[in-house]
Interface confidence: low
């Protein structure tokens, strides 16, 4: 016989005995020669034991790749498969040899005085008792004890195979302590070794209750509890339940085995406890215990029984939530109820839907809270059975740490002309409004020239010795105005102003605003120069495509070599001792500009013209002048802001209105845009002309119609136009009542 897969054009080894089965008598010599095409080896029964001392494998004298296996005086135990194979391949030829030994028909396992057979009590499982035969056609039966029982092959599920042993359904011998095979030859009985029978299977892996927790019902509802035990194979399970009300009419227990996937190494048992109509006395702990005899496991769950469905808010439900801008806000809906309620959140009456910024569920989560999230949030709980509703309002207040508006707008290097009066401003936005805004100051040189202090672009003022503005000894005379409150860009802001009555010394001023959630501060570099002076003509803030001139005026007797520069886009590298106007010392960062020089009796005026100003022209412009005597350079810096052109828009709508004859109508039309748009009014698409009854004020923003008449009824249009286009709004005015004829008409 041949086994294995064919390899690269190799023929199977060829045996000298061309049979699958060879039967020989005991005490004779077994000799088989094997020839092949590469190195060969032999395998024989029990060749891992000491018996190989009797087995001889020799090279053939007549050729390469040939080996002869010889066993003199064979015995029954030499029965088995003899295999010749190519080394390191699966290619082999096999012959099964029976050594007929009628005195010892069963092959004995060399080391075993007795064997062990492990069985499970599965009806479908068979077990093989490995009593192999040295004779192929024996009559073999299986003896089990105690009590003694004999099993004879039935041609079906009970059989004996000389190469395999005795096969029998395992449940048939699960009662037995031991088994052995017996053969009858010429009225003589021969027995195999004894095999001890071990029945396996007792482990319970786990016991799981379903539902596992949080079971709530109301009186009259059905309770169904499932208890599942997972075990190893061939385990029998007994279930035991403990529950509050043992005298229950409507209690039902059903136990069954669950089907598991074929090939599964696990068994499942299920016990189901059903109570059709629960009462309050059924509330309590339910315990399911599963026992396999050698092992018990249990699990418990608590069942709560309510009188009826209900919903209510828990005591921990908040009414006020405070947060700071940017924080994550979590408002949990804390409730008691059965069954769990449907939860809906509303903000200022509008339902909230979940998205990437807000999650509206059991917990209302605002990922990164902003001011616009301030408001009243209503959570409505609805009981899905009774439809009972409960609502609760949570006020969310979002706080904003003080933010100082000018911080990002003002150039840190603006200069101020010696002797002038100047006003410094801090416009603070904070929620709640700042409880104080304090001003501090210190001399510029005290701050800028301390070499031990590290100075960085992010923190250009490392000095700590700030003085209160009340103490202006050695500095400029200061007056702090009372805080003003202004509505700017739709926000209530606090404006604090500091008046420097005469700019005599260079200093740093700091305003500090504090509210309950934070603080903000702005440091203003107040560099006083006796040098050139910059003015803008015609406007401080030109709009795109307008022209603007920057004038640098210097006393001709003191200064010479006036030059215009523009600061590059990179922030200046700031070095110790160069604060806060280092531009004169670092001309590499400046771009020289073309300019025109004019003179009058006392001054030189260097004019740099920007025709059709663009947003790219924004930035810091530097006028440099040199002292005629000392040759020291003086720089003045002015920040130029160019306003973007914006097409007209009209804020707010005109409302249709009905008015009685003789009354007045007042409407306003607020337009914005850059350049500022012109406002015109139309009635029924005709230009509205002012007369004694029709008055236009505030650049046509406000329209008043006094003592209205029937003929004032119609379609009124407000139109705001600039070079960038027009915007309009319309409203229909209905005039009611009969016209009174008067002499005044």
């Amino acid at each position: 016989a041949s086994v294995g897969l064919p390899s690269v054009s190799l023929d199977l080894p060829r045996l000298s005995i061309q049979k699958d089965i060879l039967t020989i008598k005991a005490n004779t010599t077994l000799q088989i020669t094997c020839r092949g095409q590469r190195d060969l080896d032999w395998l024989w029964p029990n060749n891992q034991s000491g018996s190989e001392q009797r087995v001889e494998v020799t090279e053939c004298s007549d050729g390469l790749f040939c080996k002869t296996l010889t066993i003199p005086k064979v015995i029954g135990n030499d029965t088995g498969a003899y295999k010749c194979f190519y080394r390191e391949t699966d290619l082999a030829s096999v012959i099964y040899v029976y050594v007929q030994d009628y005195r010892s028909p069963f092959i004995a396992s060399v080391s075993d005085q007795h064997g062990v057979v492990y069985i499970t009590e599965n009806k479908n499982k068979t077990v093989v008792i490995p009593c192999l035969g040295s004779i192929s056609n024996l009559n073999v039966s299986l003896c089990a004890r105690y009590p003694e029982k004999r099993f004879v092959p039935d041609g079906n599920r009970i059989s004996w195979d000389s190469k395999k042993g005795f096969t029998i359904p395992s449940y048939m011998i699960s009662y037995a302590g031991m088994v052995f095979c017996e053969a009858k030859i010429n009225d003589e009985s021969y027995q195999s070794i004894m095999y001890i029978v071990v029945v396996v299977g007792y482990r319970i892996y786990d016991v799981v209750l379903s539902p596992s927790h949080g079971i709530e019902l109301s009186v009259g509802e059905k309770l169904v509890l499932n208890c599942t035990a997972r075990t190893e194979l061939n385990v029998g399970i007994d279930f035991n339940w403990e529950y509050p009300s043992s005298k229950h009419q409507h209690k039902k227990l059903v136990n069954r085995d669950l089907k598991t996937q074929s090939g599964s190494e696990m068994k499942k048992f299920l016990s189901t406890l059903t109570i059709d109509g629960v009462t309050r006395s059924d509330q309590g702990l339910y315990t399911c215990a599963a026992s396999s005899g050698l092992m018990t496991k249990k699990n418990s769950t608590f069942v709560r029984v309510h009188e009826k469905p209900f919903v209510a808010f828990g005591s921990g439900m908040e009414s006020l939530v405070e947060a700071t801008v940017g924080e994550r806000v979590r408002i949990p809906a804390k409730y008691l109820g059965y069954p769990p309620p449907e939860i809906k959140w509303y903000k200022n009456g509008i339902p909230l839907e979940s998205n990437h910024t807000i999650k509206a569920g059991h917990v209302l989560t605002i990922m990164e809270v902003s001011e616009r999230d301030t408001g009243n949030y209503t959570v409505i709980l609805t009981n899905p059975i009774s439809k009972e509703k409960q609502s609760h309002v949570v006020s969310l207040v979002v706080y904003v740490p003080p933010q100082i508006g000018e911080k990002s707008l003002i150039s840190p290097v603006d200069s101020y002309q010696y002797g002038t009066t100047q006003t410094l401003t801090c416009t603070v936005y904070a929620i709640p409004p700042p409880h104080h805004i304090h001003w501090y100051w210190q001399l510029e040189e005290e701050c800028a020239n301390e070499p031990s202090q590290a100075v960085s672009v992010t923190n250009p003022y490392p000095c700590e010795e700030w003085r209160s503005v009340e103490d202006f000894q050695g500095g400029n005379k200061i007056e702090v105005n009372k805080n003003q409150f202004a509505l700017i860009e739709g926000k209530n802001k606090t404006v604090s102003t500091l008046v420097i009555q005469a700019a005599n010394v260079s200093a740093l001023y700091k305003c500090e605003a504090v509210n309950k959630v934070g603080r903000g501060e702005r440091v203003i570099s107040f560099h006083v120069t006796r040098g050139p002076e910059i003015t803008l003509q015609p406007d401080m803030q030109p709009t795109e495509q307008e022209s603007v001139s920057l004038w640098c005026t210097a006393d001709r007797s003191t200064f010479e070599n006036l030059t215009w520069y523009k600061l590059g886009p990179q922030p200046l590298p700031i070095h110790v001792g160069e604060l806060p106007t280092p531009v004169c010392k670092n001309l590499d960062t400046l771009w020289k500009l073309n300019a025109t020089m004019f003179s009058n009796s006392t001054n030189d005026i260097l004019i740099m013209e920007l025709k059709n100003a663009s947003l790219q022209d924004q930035g810091d412009y530097v006028c440099l002048a040199q002292d005629r005597k000392t040759k020291k350079r003086h720089c003045v810096v002015r920040q130029l802001t160019v306003l973007e052109r914006v097409a007209p828009t009209i804020t707010g709508n005109l409302e249709n209105q009905t008015t009685s004859i003789g009354e007045s109508i007042e409407v306003s039309c607020t337009a914005s845009g850059n350049p500022p748009p012109q406002i015109m009014w139309f009635k029924d698409n005709e230009t509205l002309v002012e007369d004694s009854g029709i008055v236009l004020k505030d650049g046509n923003r406000n329209l008043t119609i006094r003592r209205v008449r029937k003929e004032d009824e119609g379609l009124y249009t407000c139109q705001a136009c600039s070079v960038l286009g027009c915007a309009k709004v319309e409203a229909f005015f209905i005039i009611e009542g009969a016209q009174e004829k008067t002499n005044l008409e």
Epitope: E327, I404, G518, G520, E521
Partner: nanobody, 121 residues
């Protein structure tokens, strides 16, 4: 939401310097106070340095005053810790954190994963 990623940690000899960086992604970085915390094995997390959202006020633990400098660059959404004259007791995992108030660790909302600093003697 703000995500924070620290870098710049490593092994350095006593007396040496390191500069830790913390890059932030997400909106409104400039409205957060930023802090550097550290945690040595078996010790509690401590605040080393902090800088206010407007970068005008800073805080330093006594153990690092004069040696460490915290700074921020709102344009780059980054905060830095310059560590000079390092000592073996500065060995720890350094964390960058963001919040609205300066000094209370429990009030820092967002945290980085941390970067290891080891100072050998």
């Amino acid at each position: 939401q703000v995500q924070l990623v620290e870098s710049g940690g490593g092994l350095v000899q006593a007396g040496g310097s390191l500069r830790l960086s913390c890059a932030a992604s997400g909106r409104a970085f400039s409205s957060y106070a930023m802090g550097w915390f550290r945690q040595a094995p078996g010790k509690e997390r401590e605040l080393v340095a902090a800088i206010s959202w407007s970068d005008d006020s800073t805080y330093y633990a006594n153990s690092v005053k004069g040696r460490f400098t915290i700074s921020r660059d709102n344009a780059k959404s980054a905060v830095y810790l310059q560590m000079n004259s390092l000592k073996p007791e500065d060995t720890a995992v350094y964390y960058c954190a963001a919040h609205k108030s300066l000094q209370r660790p429990d009030e820092y909302t967002y945290w980085g994963q941390g970067t290891q600093v080891t100072v050998s003697s």
